[in-house]
Every structure is written in C-alpha cells, then in structure tokens.
Interface confidence: low
C-alpha cells in the first residue's frame, strides 16, 4: 500500500491496533522491513507498507482526520471529499474524520444528502456498520451533538464555533463518498439546530446534546420539523430529567408558523402538544445549574408524524357539566407489541394537547378530537357514582343507569361503563330494575349480545361477584344488600345498534340482611340457568342469596341443581339451602355441607330458594348452578 | 437540464392492463416527489398518485385506489403507473411531475405526456 | 374533496396590458402553518404545464416577475402585469391542501 498526502492538506492517518482480539497470531505494520503496531502519516508524507498478515481488517483500524482551520484564512465549503480515497486505503475499518475550527460568530452547516440521518441512542448500533458522529464546541469543552446512522430524518445540522464530524466505514462497505456537504452560514446564537424532514409518515426519535449525559448547562438546542401539510406531527418524550436551577427555568418552547401564540413554552413534565399541521421548531433551553448539586438535564423524545384521519378534523364535544362524579378515559385497548412502525393513535383535548389517553371530569364541557389511523385502538372506560348519604332523603328514590347520547356519538368504542351505588350502612339497600329482563351469562347458556352488566361488590373488603347480565332472559330484578358496582361492558361495536336495550333502574330501598335476591319470572319453553354468586371462587364466607321464582297458573316449574353434593367443607357454621313455597309457606331444608342435592323437584306455585353458606375450609367452596324449566299443568291441582 | 419522458401509452380493450414508465435525468431523482397527473379529452386536469421523495410513501386519487399502483426504481431513474381494470374513464394524455417537499413546490417539471386511449 | 371553480375564459385582453384571472376554492387553503397551498399553471398550445406560482404567492424558478398572485384563503387572483404573446395559454390553480390535490378547470387567457 502506498498513502501520500499532499502538503498543506492538514491530513493525518493514522493506523493503529483496534479492540484486542483472541486471534493467536499477531499481525504487523511492515516498513523496510521493520515490524510496528502503529502508523502515523502526515501532510506531506508518503509512505510504503505492508501488513505481516492475510486479514489486517481483524486487527488494525485506520483514522483520517482532516483539519480544517477557518479562523485565518477562507473555509472550503461545499461537498466534503473522501481524501484518501477510499479505493487507496488499505480495506480495514476506517474513520475520517473532519475537525472544523471557526469564528464563535460563523454558523457551519452540515448538509446531508439523501439517505437522511436517524438518530441514535447510547448502546445502539447502526444495521449497516456505518456512523456519523457528530459533535460541537463551547469555547474549550466538546458538545457531543449525538450519533446518527443512514436513513432516517435529519437533512441537516447547524452549528457554530466549530464542528467534528467523525463517519465510520466499518472494512467491507463500499461507500466512497462522505455523504454531506458544509455550508457557512449566519451566526445562529445556540448550540446547535438540527433539521429533520418528513417526506411522509414516520418518526424520528431524537436526544439533547451530550445525551445520556447533561446537556451543556444554560445553552439553548433547536429542532426544525420539516412537514408536509397534509400530515400531522405529535411530540412525546420518552426519557428526560431535570437538572437544578438557581436562575431561570428548563423548558421546551415550540414555534409553530402561522400560531398567534408563538411561541408556545411548556415544561418538560408537562404533555407535550400535537395534531400540529405542517412545519414546526422545538427548541431545548437549559437553565443555570446549581454549583453545589447540578444535577443533569436530558431529554430523549419522539416525533410521530401519520396522515389526519377523517375524525382528526372533527371536534367532538363530551358536555359532562351537568354530570356530578363521573370521569371518562379514553385509551389504548391491549394489544400485542408489533415490532414493524404503527402509526401513533392519540385523542386530543382543544385539538392541540394530544396524548395516548385522556379522562375527562363532570362539571365540564370538553371538545375533543382524535389522531388516529384506526379508531379501532382505543377504547372508552367511565366511571359514574351515585351515593347516598341521607337515607330519609333518598329512600324509594330512583335514578337511570343509562349510558349519555354523548358518549354514545363518540367514535370510540364503549369499553366499560361502571356506576358505583353507594348507600348508609345498614339503612338502605338497592333495587336494580332492567327495561328488559336479564339472563344470567353461564357455561350452559352463555350470553351472545353487544353487552352485559357485571354486578360486584363494592365493599373494599367484600370478594362478591353477583354475575354477569344481559338482556333476554327471566330475571326481573336484583335486590342487594349494600354498595354495588354496575358495569355495562361491551363486546362488539352493535352495541352502538343495540344500546336502545339497554336501560337499568336502581331505587334505594328500605334495608334488608340477605345478600342478594335475585326475582325471576321464567318464560314458558325455556330454561333458565341461575347459579350462585363468585361462581368459581365459592359464595362467600357466612353470606346468604335468595331467589324468589314465579310459577304462572297454568305452569309447573321443574328445580333442577347440576351436581349431587354441593361440594363446600365447612370449617365454622353449617350451609343449608331452604326451597320454600309461597303459597303454603312450606318449605324443604337441606344440609350443603352433608345432604346429596335434591333431586329434581316440580312446583306448582311460586317459590323460594335460600342459600347459605358456612364458613368453608380452603378449597372447599360452595358454587351451586341450578334451572328452572316451566311446562303447562295437564292436570289441575289447585 | 431536467428532463423526465414518459412512454407506454396505447390502446388498450376496458378490464385491460398497461404500465407506463417515466424516465427522469438531469436531478437527484430519489430525491424528489414524482406524481402522475392525467388530462382529459376535455382538457381537465387530474391528480392521479404520488411517491414521495426519499421514503417512497404512496398516495392516490379515490378514481384508481386498488387499480393503479405508483413505483421507482432509483438505479435506472424510472417512475412507474401500473395501471389496471381500466376503463372509458381513464383514458387521458398522462404526465409525470416532479415536487420538492423541501422548497415545497409542486408540478416543478412535467414530461411530455404519454396518451391512454381505452376503448373497444 | 376541496374543489376549485375557475371561468373558462378571461376577458380578452391587449398585449401590454395586465390581466387578471381568478380562481376561488371550497375550502379555505390557508394552513395553519401560515402556509396557502395554492399553485397556478400555464399550459401553452400544444404543451405540457409549467408550474409559475406555488404556495400562493412565491414565484417558481425561471418565471418572469411580470407574474404575480395573491388571495385570501379561499379567492385567489393571479394577475400578469404586462401581457405578451407567449402568455397565451391555459392557466390552472390546483391545491395540495389535502389528498386528493385538485385542479381547477382551467382560464383560457384571451389576446384582443
């Protein structure tokens, strides 16, 4: 190999060991014979050697670093030449370097051609092996500006006072071009101002100076967005920490062209704006730290830019203001990661704070809209409570669990709506009452509609699950003991179709001592499936529920359970089921904890079934399912 | 000097396939936003599709969504309309433009045009 | 889709003289950004378009500045300060607003 450089190129390679490696033999600079393991060539030198083995790219790497001193004389600007060729270089891994010295008022631009650059983070690498780094200066102290691979965003990056620009070419890639240019340009009194471009949708993930370190204290840092029109770009950060300020504040400022706001300042913590049409700046400024405990300041942040969906120029007012204790939350319903680019999917309150997900409170009137690709990916989920904390004042009251129209007009699938009922303790119960009877979701006859109602406990330190309902069944009402929680929760987007079925009555009425007392009027030629509450889990410890079954005239009702032994081993208490009829008050008692479950029973009139549980050993639970089938009386025995 | 010369028209019978090519020169052609625009007989322009510069995102007209589709190939600086399931209404002088998303001009330079004529 | 109304023709006019035509949208091009996204094209017998204006008001490289535009968000007007012969043609606004970019129908620019 022959490298000469010419005179006054201010051009120093230098080739020298790379990372140790476990290869036995080692591997020698030869020059006149003479055996070296590094090599300096200067301007104006020109030397001849050789390596001592077949692969010199396993163990040496070659640095070219070109000085270039625009403090005393004109700077060349314009394309940057790869100098040596790289087709004269010997092929080991290589890195040209140019170190640019210039005035503090001179701005350098570098200029990068298409592929544009993408910004990376520490302990990443780049797939093709090659890397820019580029980095700055503040007076003495080196500003690392970040490191960047090929195709990305980043078209240009301005800076002033001088610029090191460091590109890697790992020994096999063929590259023989520098990629990017250097412009002169007016001072830009900051540290550094990077351009990204968006051609179409994308997005570029981008750092502070020096990051993972602390950016450089009080110094200001500029990223222009370059977007088209007809896209829309979201700001989140990913990563940041806030350094300690004795003067001045550490912010992000936005200047938005067009905006009467500009520009528009927000802290770091706060969430960050987007729905932000064309192009914008986002500017870094640091603060001054404190000399005794610094701390650092550093942000890492993304920018997503996706095409304005239909609904993104739709406002959607949710008016809550003559709503008490509500909230409703829009967000991401769970989905698998997908490792390829998706589009951002944010709702945006005032069509500028846009975020992945948003709860907004009663008293308020809130205009939302969205930016989002597939509304499909976000789901709604409101909360509603009703208490009642005087009993006189609300005994036989009654309110509408109904789902607002407003919130049905939303283009946003219902996930779950709750209503917490809350009553004094041991002065009122409540009574639900469905427009259309429920049915009991079970195994055996599942519930197949756009939506149930879950009923819970909601006692903190009660575990009872009352079931899930849905409408088109036999149950007329269910009465509860104490504070419940009523969900209304969707599976599939007829809900929207179907949501005129759905209506729930709750009145607080006078208390009563049983769980729960669940009504039900069977319809003739179907079976109804009941079962106790927390199926799976057992009815809870020393709790008792109740259901009271109408028989028509002209009926018979025939009980049957779907297990022989109720199962429950009880620890305290006995467990017993009372099957009671209502006209002669007679009844049947059984013992769960030792009988075999009765066989199935008819009944000509209505009746009752009372279960109540012991206090049961661990695993032991006590889960009855039972039905009632009616017929028509052949025989009249009243 | 920018040039860009479309081929690939013809007659073609409705339901048939036909692609056309552009082939640019005197620019950075991965660089630039290439869109194909159509004439009517009755001189009416319309967009037909774009490939944006750089990242080779695509975006077409609701007329030919599912019908056409818009490619490059950067080593031999051709710009592509695949164009099929055609009909009476397709036919038009087609031109391919170019735009630069950095200045933001748009329809900078236009080709010649190639004709489509789809008749039976 | 935003549509754009252009007369298809322009009051004859005398080499020399300016000329004005005008082009009106559906929906306002003026962007957010500040940006109106507005473009004018000539097409000269038997030519194909050449782009003179884009974003409104700026001036595409190699046209003349006898050409200029102006409007609000939704009127535009582009108006030819002296008219020559080569001017003749066909004048097209377009917007590149929002897919799908549309064109107007077309000015024919007439000389007395």
């Known amino acids: 190999f022959e490298i000469a450089l010419p005179r006054e190129s201010n051009i120093t390679v230098l080739i020298k060991l790379g990372t140790p490696t476990l290869l036995a033999k080692p591997c020698y600079i030869v020059i006149s014979k003479r055996h070296i393991t590094m090599l300096s060539i200067k301007s104006g030198e020109r030397i001849v050697f050789t390596f001592s083995c077949q692969s010199p790219e396993n163990h040496f790497v070659i640095e070219i670093q070109k000085n270039i001193d625009c403090m005393s004389g004109p700077c060349p600007f314009g394309e940057v030449q790869l100098q040596p060729s790289t087709s004269l270089l010997p092929t080991l891994n290589r890195t040209f370097i140019w170190d640019v010295k210039a005035h503090k008022s001179i701005g350098l631009e570098l200029q990068f051609s298409i592929p544009r650059l993408r910004q990376i983070g520490p302990g990443e690498s780049c797939p093709d092996g090659v890397t820019h780094s580029i980095s700055g200066r503040i007076d003495a102290t080196v500003v690392r500006i970040g490191t960047f691979c090929s195709n990305g965003t980043v078209s240009r990056i301005k800076m002033q006072e001088g610029v090191k620009m460091a590109l890697h070419l790992p020994w096999f890639h063929p590259r023989n071009v520098s990629g990017f240019s250097i412009a002169n340009r007016s001072s830009i009194k900051r540290l550094c101002i990077i351009e990204s471009v968006f051609e179409g949708e994308g997005s570029a993930t981008l750092m502070s100076a020096n990051y993972p370190e602390g950016f450089p204290e009080d110094e200001l840092m500029t990223w222009q967005f370059v977007v088209p029109a007809h896209l829309r770009a979201s700001v989140s950060f990913l990563n940041f920490n806030l350094s300690n300020c004795e003067r001045k504040e550490e912010r992000v400022e936005y200047y938005i062209p067009g905006s009467t706001t500009n520009p528009e300042v927000f802290k770091l913590e706060d969430k960050q704006p987007g729905n932000m049409a064309g192009n914008f700046n986002l500017s870094l400024q640091g603060c001054d730290q404190d000399a005794q405990s610094p701390g650092i300041l550093r942000l890492q942040f993304q920018v997503l830019v996706q095409h304005p969906q239909n609904e993104s120029n739709k406002i959607y007012v949710v008016d809550l203001s003559n709503e008490r204790a509500m909230s409703l939350t829009i967000e991401p319903r769970p989905v698998k990661q997908s490792r390829k680019f998706v589009p951002g999917c944010f709702v945006c309150l005032e069509s500028r704070t846009c975020s992945s997900n948003l709860t907004l409170t009663s008293g308020s009137k809130h205009k939302i809209s969205f930016l989002c690709d597939d509304l499909t990916r976000l789901w709604m989920n409101v909360e509603k409570t009703i208490s009642c904390t005087d009993h006189r004042y609300c005994q036989r009251k009654s309110y509408s669990l109904q789902v607002p129209s407003d919130i049905l007009h939303l283009p946003v699938e219902l996930h779950d709506f709750s209503w917490k009922l809350l009553v004094p303790k041991d002065r009122l119960s409540l009574v639900l009452v469905p427009a259309q009877k429920l049915q009991q979701h079970t195994h055996e006859k599942p519930c197949n509609t756009s939506f149930s109602y879950l009923v819970a406990s909601a006692i903190p330190s009660q575990d009872l699950y009352f079931g899930s309902f849905c409408p088109g069944g036999s149950i007329k009402q269910i009465q509860v003991k104490q504070n419940i929680s009523v969900t209304l929760r969707t599976f599939a987007p007829s809900f929207q179709q179907e949501a005129s079925r759905q209506g729930l009555t709750v009145s607080f009425i006078p208390y009563f001592k049983e769980e729960g007392v669940f009504t039900v009027t069977p319809d003739t030629k179907s079976k109804v499936y009941l079962r106790t509450p927390n199926w799976d889990r057992g009815l809870p410890s020393l709790t008792s529920v109740s259901w009271n079954i109408s028989v028509p005239r002209d009926q018979v009702a025939c009980l049957t359970f779907f297990k022989e032994r109720s199962g429950v081993v009880c620890q305290t208490g006995r467990a017993f089921m009372i099957i009671q009829e209502q006209r002669t008050r007679a009844e049947e008692i059984f013992s769960l904890d030792e009988d075999v479950l009765p066989k199935p029973s008819f009944h000509h009139h209505s009746f009752w079934v009372n279960i109540s549980n012991c206090s049961p050993t661990s695993g032991k639970q006590l889960d009855l399912l039972f039905s009632v089938t009616l017929t028509p009386r052949t025989v009249d025995l009243t | 000097e920018v040039q860009l010369k479309e081929s690939g028209g013809g007659l073609v019978k409705p339901g048939g396939s036909l692609k056309l090519s552009c082939t640019a020169s005197g620019f950075t052609f991965s660089v630039y936003g290439m869109s194909w625009v159509r004439q009517t007989p009755e001189k009416r322009l319309e967009w037909v599709a774009t490939?944006?510069?750089?990242?080779?995102?695509?975006y077409y007209s609701d007329s030919v969504k599912g019908r056409f589709t818009i490619s490059r190939d950067t080593g031999k600086n051709n710009l592509y309309l695949q164009m099929s399931s055609l009909s009476s209404d397709d036919t038009a002088l087609y031109y391919c433009a170019t735009e630069d998303g950095l200045i933001g001009t748009w329809g900078d330079y236009w080709g010649q045009g190639t004709t489509v004529t789809v008749s039976s | 889709d935003i549509v754009m109304t252009q007369a298809a023709f322009s009051n004859p006019v005398t080499l020399g003289t300016s000329a004005s035509i005008s082009c009106r949208s559906t929906k306002s091009l003026l962007h957010s950004n500040g940006i109106t996204y507005l473009y004018w094209f000539l097409q000269k017998p038997g030519q194909s378009p050449q782009l003179l204006i884009y974003q409104m008001s700026n001036l595409a490289s190699g046209v003349p500045d006898r050409f200029s535009s102006s409007g609000s968000g939704t009127d535009f007007t582009l108006r030819i300060s002296r008219v020559e012969a080569e001017d003749v043609g066909v004048y097209y606004c377009?917007?590149?607003?929002?897919?799908?970019?549309?064109f107007g129908g077309g000015t024919k620019l007439e000389i007395k």
């Open positions: 490939l944006s510069g750089g990242s080779n995102y695509t």
């Open positions: 377009a917007q590149n607003l929002e897919l799908p970019f549309t």
